[in-house]
């Protein structure tokens, strides 16, 4: 069949059809059903809710709807012997005691179920000693801390604010720092933006409101006893002393009601700088231990969760592709929440239920995509990305011959201010391309495209007259198939100004207080920008999969590259000495993406000219272009980072949110200053060169003429 | 509307146990301090203990520190007052007082009050 | 422990006057003090938090003010129905003490 026959719609019409279905009230109607009681990963209110999308998604047309179960470490408070923490008098007696659970919002007073405030995976222990404040615990701060104010971490609890960094980075530091507990917090300065309320009355944190989360460091490689293979039936699991990432201290997160009653006795060195001062009223004094009258006084933690192995389900539903049904593109996000969800996921939930309803309409009409769509609702994503993760295990040979795309779909929102896009280079053009077509909602944009809103909003740093798009990170479900898989992927969300709101994340992420009405009262009444991520998302998918050829542009690999060449050169020109005298070149790199740029440029001529009437040529150029993404993969993986494969980018080893380039030449290259044998150190700087110069070398010549 | 009501109170022997119970209705039981403030006969008010939201923290007055134990029950929105050792000065009404709501306030007073219930301890 | 002292410990005013009443603290509580007044007989009731922030429905002529130890509760003109006891509390740390009272008659 031609792609016309397939599609019954003629194709200008396709897009706008499936455009012109996405209702703002549906999105609204979805995200209330959703957000009604506590969809923890492992409980049966998650399980009801993965069988009722189940349901919907069969009722909205989609060929086939399945459940994939795995069974995953996951971790839980003990419900009888609850987490906190004390601050103890020189008898043992406890004088204060941080918050059992979050103060409920109105409306929710009598739900049960939900999870007090924890650390998943925090191991059980009640250290108790005296309290070194760390700042974000960066890696920069512990490099503060140690050796230019020589304060020695080791046996102290140390306390770390909330931002900057994913928070399992934080407890990773404070580790290998010595600590023996870690208390987080969110300070007002990063939680609480200024002339805005605390919720119910506006979207600030109160003061009882506290940020849950995972704390492990697994660096992609999903249910911490299987890595690599899928959590089945018949699994083998390692042993929880082999288990991968989990931390070894009590970590333990709590509001800034009870961080200032910590932080206001602590002596000892006053911060170093003002960038260590939040904006409690507390003296942000870095310790170690209490001041004057309180010295003899300790903090102890009470930390008493388990791990546990648990069943989770992803819902996974197919809409068959009428031409290429063996190429995949994927819609995914993940439905498991902290409570309530109201923006993280069930905003990005509410939008793809949306999606795939559109979608289905259409099928309904006689329509179908070119190639074959897959949609997914996510389970453990807040455990680790363990639902995601493990179904691309099971599937990874089908994945990585079939995968044309990865679309993430988590909170939609986490601001109204402007569109932000993290992508593969690879879907530049065609996120330039649609963004063009489609109604910006911000005001003042009236009649303008969501292109000029955004580009105005948020413009690239490097080229005028186009927006910002950065670099995929991790700490979300796309990191499986991009990072480890080499399938391209992109995400899109509304986001804050980043300018005027300096803090970290959207206030209430995590926390009980992220309702249904925090969206609809305060960010999005209208669910006008639920409906432009939903047009987003979804005209990207769309054209992904029915475009007959893929919207993917080569050349803007060839740009990126040049520049990461550039400033890893540049971060390795700070050591000039060195470098001559361990003869480091970058000479090779720097070929490798010349020939890269002329190879992409050459191709994309000749995507312009083949016949694209020769299903044959068609679907080799479109190989090849579905095939770049996954040239750059590694199959040795990054040193000490297995699952995390792709050369050109990984995870930040120092913020799992961070984007990194040539992440192996600049782990190679960080603070080798301090490296105890610098031969060696600059060795391995070496051998990353020619790691990522060979890698592109390969992949560019994946685009060469195949004969 | 917003209610507190005290029982429990009643003539006791020196030595001898009472336990307060004060009911809550009308508010959000589960986000609220809850404080006991007892008046002796012709005397000003006396702060005898306060329970934070969660439990999570109780404290007392000196005078009945290790004789008096603040709880609550959040399901059945009321909180409690057991009085052990009493002793012939701790003859007076006792008032149940709601504190702060946690979800706006760490620190305030107390702002709903019970009609009180009186403990006589006498031999 | 924070002991609370008031002054006077009783007082007699007009109606129509501005009446003036003090309570110090022994160690500095910020701002947080609370003041009730309760009338014979009668229930405590909550007029003022934060030292200075009055509680909803009690008659503007009442007014705190005050920081740190010492602190104030003015009320700008005498009203019959203000006759009773004045209590001022810390709530800054436990244990929460009240000031002894100040008893306001009218003249």
């Known amino acids: 069949k031609s792609s016309n026959e397939a599609t019954n719609i003629t194709p200008k019409h396709n897009m706008k059809a499936f455009l012109d279905e996405l209702k703002a009230e549906n999105i609204k109607k979805f995200l209330y059903n959703f957000t009604q009681i506590p969809h923890l990963a492992g409980t049966e209110q998650n399980f009801q809710l993965a069988k009722q999308i189940q349901s919907q998604w069969k009722e909205f047309g989609l060929d086939s709807v399945e459940l994939a179960h795995y069974d995953v470490l996951l971790s839980y408070p003990n419900k009888t012997h609850p987490n906190y923490i004390s601050i103890i008098n020189e008898d043992g007696n406890e004088i204060f005691n941080t918050s059992l659970f979050e103060p409920p919002p109105p409306g929710y007073e009598n739900v049960s179920d939900i999870v007090p405030p924890f650390s998943a995976f925090s191991p059980q222990g009640m250290p108790e000693g005296d309290l070194v404040y760390v700042n974000y615990a960066r890696t920069e701060d512990f490099f503060k801390l140690e050796r230019d104010m020589k304060i020695n971490c080791s046996g102290k609890i140390v306390i770390a604010r909330y931002g900057k960094v994913f928070r399992g980075n934080k407890v990773k530091n404070a580790q290998l720092a010595g600590a023996k507990g870690v208390i987080l917090y969110s300070d007002p300065a990063d939680y609480f933006a200024p002339g805005v309320k605390s919720y119910p009355d506006g979207w600030n944190l109160p003061g009882g409101g506290v940020q849950r989360g995972n704390i492990l460091n697994l660096n992609g490689a999903g249910d911490p006893l299987t890595p690599g293979y899928p959590a089945n039936e018949y699994a083998y699991r390692r042993g929880i002393a082999e288990a991968v990432g989990l931390p070894s201290i009590p970590v333990h997160p709590i509001g800034y009601y009870d961080a200032q009653k910590l932080l206001e006795k602590m002596g000892g060195s006053a911060p170093p700088d003002s960038s260590w001062r939040g904006s409690l009223k507390v003296p942000y004094n870095v310790g170690p231990g209490f001041t004057g009258n309180f010295s003899t006084q300790k903090v102890k933690m009470h930390i008493h969760s388990t791990n546990e192995v648990t069943r989770i389900y992803n819902v996974i539903g197919t809409l068959r592709g009428a031409v290429e049904p063996d190429r995949y593109v994927i819609l995914g996000g993940h439905r498991d929440s902290w409570v309530f969800g109201g923006i993280d996921p069930q905003s990005g939930a509410a939008v793809v239920h949306e999606i795939v309803r559109s979608f289905g309409t259409l099928k309904k009409e006689g329509w179908r995509p070119r190639r074959t769509i897959l949609f997914a609702s996510w389970d453990a994503e807040e455990f680790g990305l363990l639902g995601s993760t493990e179904w691309a295990e099971e599937n990874s040979r089908l994945l990585q011959e079939r995968g044309v795309a990865y679309i993430n779909a988590d909170s939609s929102i986490e601001g109204n201010y402007t569109l932000r896009v993290d992508c593969t280079p690879l879907m530049y053009s065609l996120v330039h391309n649609l963004t063009k077509e489609l109604k910006s909602p911000d005001e003042g944009f009236e009649g303008k495209s969501l292109y000029e809103s955004w580009t105005k909003k948020s413009p690239s740093p490097e080229f005028s007259g186009m927006p910002r798009i950065s670099k995929l990170g991790s700490g979300n479900d796309f990191e499986v198939f991009f990072q480890r898989l080499g399938i391209a992927s992109g995400r899109a969300r509304y986001t804050k100004n980043w300018e005027t709101n300096k803090f970290s994340g959207y206030p209430l992420y995590h926390s009980v207080y992220e309702t249904y009405e925090l969206v609809e009262k305060f960010y999005d009444p209208m669910f006008k920008y639920h409906l432009t991520v939903a047009q987003v998302r979804g005209g990207m998918v769309f054209e992904l999969a029915n475009s007959i050829v893929l919207p993917f542009d080569c050349r803007d690999y060839a740009v990126v590259l040049r520049k990461y060449a550039d400033k890893i050169y540049s971060i390795s020109m700070k050591h000039p000495q060195e470098m001559k005298t361990y003869s480091v070149s970058f000479d090779s790199l720097f070929s490798a993406v010349k020939n890269f740029t002329e190879i992409a440029s050459k191709f994309s001529e000749r995507l312009q000219d083949f016949d694209k009437s020769n299903p044959i040529v068609l679907r080799m150029m479109n190989d090849q272009l579905m095939f770049l993404e996954r040239a750059f993969i590694d199959p040795l993986g990054l040193p000490d980072r297995p699952f995390y494969r792709h050369v050109i980018y990984a995870p930040s080893s120092h913020n799992k949110y961070a984007g990194e380039s040539f992440p192996g030449i600049y782990d190679a290259l960080f603070d080798i200053e301090s490296k105890v044998d610098p031969s060696k150190a600059w060795g391995e700087v070496k051998r990353q060169i020619y790691v990522a110069a060979f890698t592109v070398q390969a992949a560019a010549e994946t685009l060469s003429e195949v004969a | 509307q917003v209610q507190l009501v005290e029982s429990g109170g009643g003539v006791v022997q020196p030595g001898r146990s009472l336990r307060l119970s004060c009911a809550a209705s009308?508010?959000?039981?589960?986000?609220?301090?809850m404080h006991w403030v007892r008046q002796a006969p012709g005397k000003g008010l006396e702060w005898v203990a306060v329970?934070?939201?969660?439990?999570?923290?109780?404290y007392y007055a000196d005078s009945v520190k290790g004789r008096f134990t603040i709880s609550r029950d959040n399901s059945k929105n009321t909180q409690y007052l057991q009085m052990n050792s009493l002793r012939a000065e701790d003859t007076a009404v006792y008032y149940c007082a709601r504190g702060g709501d946690f979800l706006y306030y760490y620190y305030y007073g107390m702002d709903v009050w019970g009609q009180g219930t009186t403990v006589t301890v006498s031999s | 422990d924070i002991q609370m002292t008031q002054s006077p410990s009783s007082l007699s005013a007009s109606v129509g006057d501005r009446v003036t009443i003090t309570c110090r603290a022994s160690?500095?509580?910020?701002?947080?003090l609370a003041w009730y007044q309760q009338k014979t007989g009668k229930v405590p009731k909550f007029l003022i938090y934060?030292?200075?922030t009055l509680q909803s429905g009690v008659p503007s002529r009442f007014s705190g003010g005050g920081s740190g130890t010492d602190f104030t509760l003015t009320i700008s003109s005498l009203q019959p129905e203000d006759v009773a006891t004045y209590y001022c509390q810390n709530y800054n740390s436990a244990p929460f003490t009240f000031g002894p009272g100040t008893k306001v008659d009218i003249k």
């Open positions: 160690q500095g509580i910020s701002n947080y």
């Open positions: 934060e030292a200075s």
């Open positions: 009308g508010f959000a039981f589960s986000r609220y301090g």
């Open positions: 329970i934070w939201y969660d439990g999570s923290n109780k």
